[in-house]
């Protein structure tokens, strides 16, 4: 289900990534240099920026981030 509208709930931040708010609703997600071989699974639909640099992701499937707007 969708998370309730709130100013005190943190948007989903994938494990080990660093996240920070981007305005009222959005989230900047930094998952760089984590040795990832695939995309993080629990990305918030409110992600405005995603850094996957310095990882081991060799290929992306079509439409790899279906939850993102």
């Amino acid at each position: 289900g969708s998370s309730p509208r709130s100013g005190v709930l943190l948007r989903g931040c994938p494990t080990h990534c660093h996240c920070e708010p981007d305005g009222r609703m959005l989230l900047r997600v930094d998952c760089s240099d984590l040795g990832l071989s695939e995309l993080p699974s629990n990305l918030s639909v409110f992600t405005s920026y995603l850094d996957l640099s310095m990882n081991n992701i060799s290929q992306l499937l079509p439409n790899p981030l279906p939850s993102l707007r």
Epitope: S6, V8, L9, L10, C13, G23, L27
Partner: antibody
Framework: QVQLVQSGAEVKKPGASVKVSCKAS????????MQWVRQAPGQGLEWIGE????????NYNQKFQGRVTLTVDTSTSTAYMELSSLRSEDTAVYYC??????????WGQGTTVTVSS | DIQMTQSPSSLSASVGDRVTITCRAS??????LNWYQQKPGKAVKLLIS???RLHSGVPSRFSGSGSGTDYTLTISSLQPEDFATYFC?????????FGGGTKLEIK
């Protein structure tokens, strides 16, 4: 700089109501939620509820549902917390605090509310 | 409601010590954890959000870690101004809930 200035200490009798104000300055009032949190003597922090000043949308802690009302006056950048049917367990310091995307970055100085017969 | 259990409730330490405070949630909170500092007569101060993100102006001796239900606040080398009470808070679901606090005192 961001400031949240709360109203002064209150002493109330059981069954009465109290209304605490929180005047915001140093930022755009309608861009941030306002949280209300209380702390009983020697205790931890307890969330009361929150209000979005842009349209007065509220979320309340079920524990206080029906007894608490959060409002804002955007013309004066002031938030209000009214708690009714006061009992001795409501004796606490009440804080307003602004939040954005899940964390509370500035807090008021607190308002002491004492409920005593 | 999610219960947040913080330990220890009080801690005596000396300037220069490394200090660790832990917070355990009653269910997985997916890294949605904040840490706050409270000093008598002063406004509560945000230290860390999203488990590990240092708020602006917070010294780098403070750090946060953890995952799932278990989270840690570490102060690498205690300074005199760090003696205070520390609270964790989960931002995973309503109502947000706080740990009981850890009072850090001078030994």
């Amino acid at each position: 700089q961001v400031q949240l200035v709360q109203s002064g200490a209150e002493v109330k009798k059981p069954g009465a109501s109290v209304k605490v104000s929180c005047k915001a300055s140093g930022y755009t009032f309608t861009n941030y939620w306002m949280q209300w949190v209380r702390q009983a003597p020697g205790q931890g922090l307890e969330w009361i509820g929150e209000i979005d000043p842009s349209d007065s949308y509220t979320n309340y802690n079920q524990k206080f549902q029906g007894r608490v009302t959060l409002t804002v006056d955007t013309s004066t950048s002031t938030a209000y917390m009214e708690l009714s049917s006061l009992r001795s367990e409501d004796t606490a310091v009440y804080y307003c605090a602004r939040s954005l995307s899940g964390y509370v970055d500035y807090w008021g100085q607190g308002t002491t509310v004492t409920v005593s017969s | 409601d999610i219960q947040m259990t913080q330990s220890p409730s009080s801690l005596s330490a000396s300037v220069g010590d490394r200090v660790t405070i832990t917070c355990r949630a009653s269910q997985d909170i997916s890294n949605r954890l904040n840490w706050y500092q409270q000093k008598p007569g002063k406004a509560v101060k945000l230290l860390i959000s999203y488990r590990s993100r240092l708020h602006s102006g917070v010294p780098s001796r403070f750090s946060g870690s953890g995952s799932g239900t278990d989270y840690t606040l570490t102060i690498s080398s205690l300074q005199p101004e760090d003696f205070a009470t520390y609270f964790c808070q989960q931002g995973n679901s309503l109502p947000p809930t706080f740990g009981g606090g850890t009072k850090l005192e001078i030994k």
